[in-house]
């Protein structure tokens, strides 16, 4: 009876996500067979989040809307470890929007999920950010510095990275 009600709950939770994520990849969390964490297929997972690399070229606002439709946001990078995981799936000759912008052009950077912007946990390329008109952030590869962030114009189409919390069932 307990297992039956747990299964019903899981099925109703899965139905919530079915519209945008018809397939989920789930793994057992810990030793308890009743706890599973899932990411949409073919998203990748790291710690408590799921990541999707969008290869379509879109403006920053459209990229954020695209992530939002999938129940996600443009990626918020909180640690060096998280960035190291993300870059494993990126192409060196491409640039990807992050969920970081400065719409007022006053160097008040803000993350899309309202995570406080912490200057101590940023990975800007040297000399960046460098232009008040460039109000959106990308991550890209520079041979001299490897992967880092750069400010660019928000209306210029780029690839992007979406991030969402894992689905627990």
């Amino acid at each position: 009876n307990f297992m039956y009600s747990k299964t019903v709950k899981r099925l109703s939770k899965l139905r919530e996500y079915q519209q945008y994520h018809p397939s989920l990849t789930c793994v057992m969390e810990g030793k308890d067979i009743e706890d599973w964490s899932c990411c949409p297929t073919p998203w990748t997972s790291f710690q408590s989040s799921c990541y999707f690399i969008s290869t379509g070229m879109q403006s920053w606002t459209k990229s954020q809307k695209n992530c939002s439709v999938m129940g996600a946001d443009l990626v918020v990078i909180n640690t060096r470890e998280e960035q190291d995981f993300i870059i494993q799936n990126l192409k060196r000759n491409s640039s990807y929007f992050l969920g970081l912008s400065d719409p007022g052009g006053r160097r008040h950077w803000q993350w899309v999920d309202q995570t406080p912007y912490n200057e101590n946990v940023t990975f800007w390329h040297s000399g960046e950010p460098n232009n008040l008109d460039e109000r959106c952030a990308i991550i890209n590869f520079r041979s001299s510095e490897e992967w880092g962030w750069n400010d660019i114009h928000c209306h210029v189409p780029q690839k992007s990275i979406c991030k969402m919390k894992k689905i627990y069932i």
Epitope: K62, Q64, K65, S101, D133, E134, H153, H155, P157
Partner: antibody, heavy 121, light 111 residues
Framework: EVQLVESGGGLVKPGGSLRLSCAAS????????MSWVRQAPGKGLEWVST????????YYPDSVKGRFTISRDNAKNSLYLQMNSLRAEDTAVYYC??????????????WGQGTTVTVSS | DIVLTQSPASLAVSPGQRATITCRAS??????????MHWYQQKPGQPPKLLIY???NLESGVPARFSGSGSETDFTLTINPVEANDAANYYC?????????FGGGTKVEIK
Amino acid sequence: EVQLVESGGGLVKPGGSLRLSCAASGFTFSSYGMSWVRQAPGKGLEWVSTISSGDSYTYYPDSVKGRFTISRDNAKNSLYLQMNSLRAEDTAVYYCARQLYYSYGYYFDYWGQGTTVTVSS
Amino acid sequence: DIVLTQSPASLAVSPGQRATITCRASESVSFHGTHLMHWYQQKPGQPPKLLIYAASNLESGVPARFSGSGSETDFTLTINPVEANDAANYYCQQSIEDPPTFGGGTKVEIK
């Protein structure tokens, strides 16, 4: 007072080339993105190219890509448009316009008087 | 590309009356309360002149007879009351993404 003055227009044969210039004054030219916008006779406005303030970014519509090149010389407060392989449909008044950024986009807050380009045999 | 459709293509208005021009975008040009639609006036033989930026902000030096409104895909430029020297072509423009695009224009004639 902000001023944008275009020059370099004229009559050219199909396949020919022209270089338009825009002399800027009254503002810190190097701090602004700039664009060229054209208007064919009796028609509406069509954006032709954009260059960022730092020269790091240029952009063109498919209709002129590979034929037109936008550039700038911040030391001379000048914007340029090199037009090659000109076609009859490139006939228009060409305006140089200053971009002012607002939130995630921009608008054109100042325009020059325009220079006329006529492509005809 | 985002397509902007203006209507009407032309209209004739008597001085003192209201003129309303609409601009419809093929997709949203708004984001988090910011509407990246702008309006320009162009008189014969002159370059375009900025009237309204970000849907509803009046450019400095533009008379308060001009106003703008709208969000997402539908925007309106209103001139009230119309004066004789408002005879011109009016264009909308979006800048939320490249390429920047303009509407086809609306010609306002004064009766």
